[in-house]
């Protein structure tokens, strides 16, 4: 009933199109703050006004829900950040076509379980991809290049769409600490026609199986079963899951007693969700009420800020969000091994991001 997620999806679609269908810059707006100045800022303001109108229209059915308030505050922040006027033109909503490309091009039918090949045949270009990651405290890098440190405890959905469900379960890093770390990851690859049976992957600290819950290492006996596979280069510390049928690669790592999650996923897949599907940290970032600012860190153990900075600087020479996350984690946990989580997350981003200009994010606080 509360259709705020439809507003979110339409906003994301309209901002993606500002950069020619690429996956970059969606919520950052692509530079240039002022009205009409910078890349796509006029378009971004139009998209934001449309988003504001859409959320206003959901107020009757969503006003008591977190997703609604997160959207309202997010729009407010972005309109101020990009110097958008309240009045002015709005962007038309994007056409609501099928999420995944189908046949019908007159060419021989492409492999239905090869998303990239199928998309390229249909559209004459490769698909756009999005990247999301969760590591350390946890820090979440959303599809739209928001970077948040979350105080979330318990189970929270990173992704919840028509094809994938990813849930992270977090608990406090240390007694009395605001910060939490991910101890368990659950990933559900939903049943898909001739490609795969539903498969569940579950990882916990000190238990990173190189198999799905049913013991299999692929998508099952269907013709496209091999389009889902699981492998490792470092047993016990690293698992990579390839889901070619939805253009997706997932990496799970264990470092310093916590789990990291990283995904590269086709845009259409990531955005294939309905109003019934709840908040997703990869889509909206951390809800405002669950965000920790860097000022909230409470140091534990003997590591000083200078030592933490020096340890992090070794593997993260650029003082970006990954560097600051590393410092945060090392200070709070007192464990130098937390540097590895941030370094690995940066390397995954380097491999997964379609636009390397967006690799280094710089925190505003």
């Amino acid at each position: 009933q509360c259709k705020i997620l439809r507003c979110n999806a339409e906003y994301v679609s309209s901002t993606l199109s500002l950069r020619g269908g690429g996956s970059s810059g969606a919520l950052r707006g692509g530079g240039g703050g002022g009205r009409g100045g910078g890349v796509g800022s006029g378009g971004l303001c139009r998209a934001l006004r449309s988003y504001a109108l859409c959320t206003r229209r959901t107020a009757r059915t969503c006003r008591g829900d977190l997703a609604f308030h997160s959207a309202v505050h997010g729009i407010e922040d972005l309109m101020i950040q990009h110097n958008c006027s309240r009045q002015g033109p709005t962007a038309p909503p994007p056409p609501r076509g099928p999420a995944l490309p189908g046949a019908g091009s007159g060419l021989p039918a492409p492999d239905p379980c090869d998303y990239e090949g199928r998309f390229s045949r249909l559209h004459g270009r490769p698909p756009g991809f999005l990247h999301c990651a969760s590591f350390g405290d946890p820090h979440v890098r959303s599809f739209h290049h928001h970077f948040h440190t979350c105080r979330v405890q318990g189970a929270w959905p990173l992704l919840d769409n028509d094809f994938l469900f990813v849930q992270a379960t977090s608990s406090p890093m240390a007694l009395g600490a605001n910060a939490t770390a991910t101890r368990k990851l659950t990933i559900i690859f939903k049943n898909m026609q001739e490609c795969i049976d539903q498969k569940v992957y579950q990882a916990e600290v000190d238990n990173l199986p190189v198999a799905f819950e049913d013991g299999s290492i692929n998508g099952g006996d269907r013709p496209g079963g091999s389009s889902l596979s699981i492998q490792t280069a470092n047993p016990g510390n690293h698992v990579e899951i390839q889901a070619a049928y939805i253009g997706t690669t997932i990496i799970i790592r264990q470092t310093a007693g916590q789990l990291s999650f990283s995904i590269k996923v086709a845009e259409d897949v990531a955005m294939a969700f309905s109003a019934e599907q709840d908040l997703q940290l990869c889509v909206g970032g951390c809800p405002p009420s669950q965000r920790l600012s860097r000022s909230e860190r409470n140091r534990r153990g003997a590591i000083t800020i200078d030592t933490a900075r020096r340890l992090c600087k070794e593997g993260l020479p650029v003082e970006d969000a990954y560097f600051h996350s590393c410092v945060f984690d090392v200070l709070i946990s007192g464990d130098p091994n937390f540097t590895v989580a941030a370094q690995a997350a940066l390397e995954d981003a380097r491999a997964f991001l379609p636009d390397l200009e967006k690799l280094h994010l710089f925190p505003s606080d």
């Epitope: 009757r60 059915t61 969503c62 006003r63 008591g64 829900d65 977190l66 609604f68 709840d278």
Partner: antibody, heavy 115, light 112 residues
């Protein structure tokens, strides 16, 4: 699967108080506004009130304003309805329901106000 | 407060036949943005209410397609294309456009 289980109903004298609870599971409770709705025996449905996800706002029907208070404990995934100065006309099955506008409902708990 | 008036209050129907319930509002339920927040609930005997239709005509997840909603402004209709035994119960319309939200008085559907 969304589940809402109300408890705390029973027999109470006019002027008395009662506190109902609604235990939620199967969804992220702290993300949603919640409602209380009641149904007198053999009658229709009457909305009592709702509370925002973070308790920042509460809205009540005129018939219960000043007597009933809705609260929630997100750490316990529980919604509450504190009912004071109860009257015979408050006799009903009380339902909690998920969302700013109710989509999923509990099975209800019976409150009887009688001397 | 907005008053929702349902008719008929009692509706005997033969299995397999269509059924139609009307809900009239004392004022328009259309917002200035053109949205109409009218919903329909079903309450089977001894059970709690279940959402069938939201925003006039959208079926909630898991609701069979024999249920449909229509209408605008002040006049709304819930239709069941072919009544089945499990459809027996009371049907309520519910408006969310104006505060306080209000229910209709209910229509009891029974099998002839």
């Amino acid at each position: 699967e969304v589940q809402l289980v109300e408890s705390g109903g029973g027999l109470v004298q006019p002027g008395g108080s009662l506190r109902l609870s609604c235990a939620a599971s199967g969804f992220t409770f702290s993300n949603y506004g919640m409602n209380w709705i009641r149904q007198a025996p053999g009658k229709g449905l009457e909305w009592i009130g709702m509370i925002y996800y973070d308790s920042s706002e509460k809205h009540y029907a005129d018939s219960v304003k000043g007597r009933f208070t809705i609260s929630r404990d997100n750490s316990k995934n529980t919604l509450y309805l504190q009912m004071n100065s109860l009257r015979a006309e408050d006799t009903a099955v009380y339902y909690c329901a998920k969302g700013t506008t109710p989509d999923y409902w509990g099975q209800g708990t019976m409150v009887t106000v009688s001397s | 407060d907005v008053v929702l008036t349902q008719s008929p209050l009692s509706l005997p129907v033969t299995l397999g036949q269509p059924a139609s319930i009307s809900c009239r509002s004392s004022q328009s339920l259309e917002t200035s943005d053109g949205d109409t927040f009218l919903e329909w609930f079903q309450q089977r005997p001894g059970q709690s209410p279940r959402l069938l239709i939201y925003e006039v005509s959208n079926r909630f997840s898991g609701v069979p397609d024999r249920f449909s909603g229509s209408g605008s402004g002040t006049d709304f209709t819930l239709k069941i294309s072919r009544v089945e035994a499990e459809d027996v119960g009371v049907y309520y319309c519910f408006q969310v456009t104006h505060d306080p939200v209000t229910f209709g008085q209910g229509t009891k559907l029974e099998i002839k």
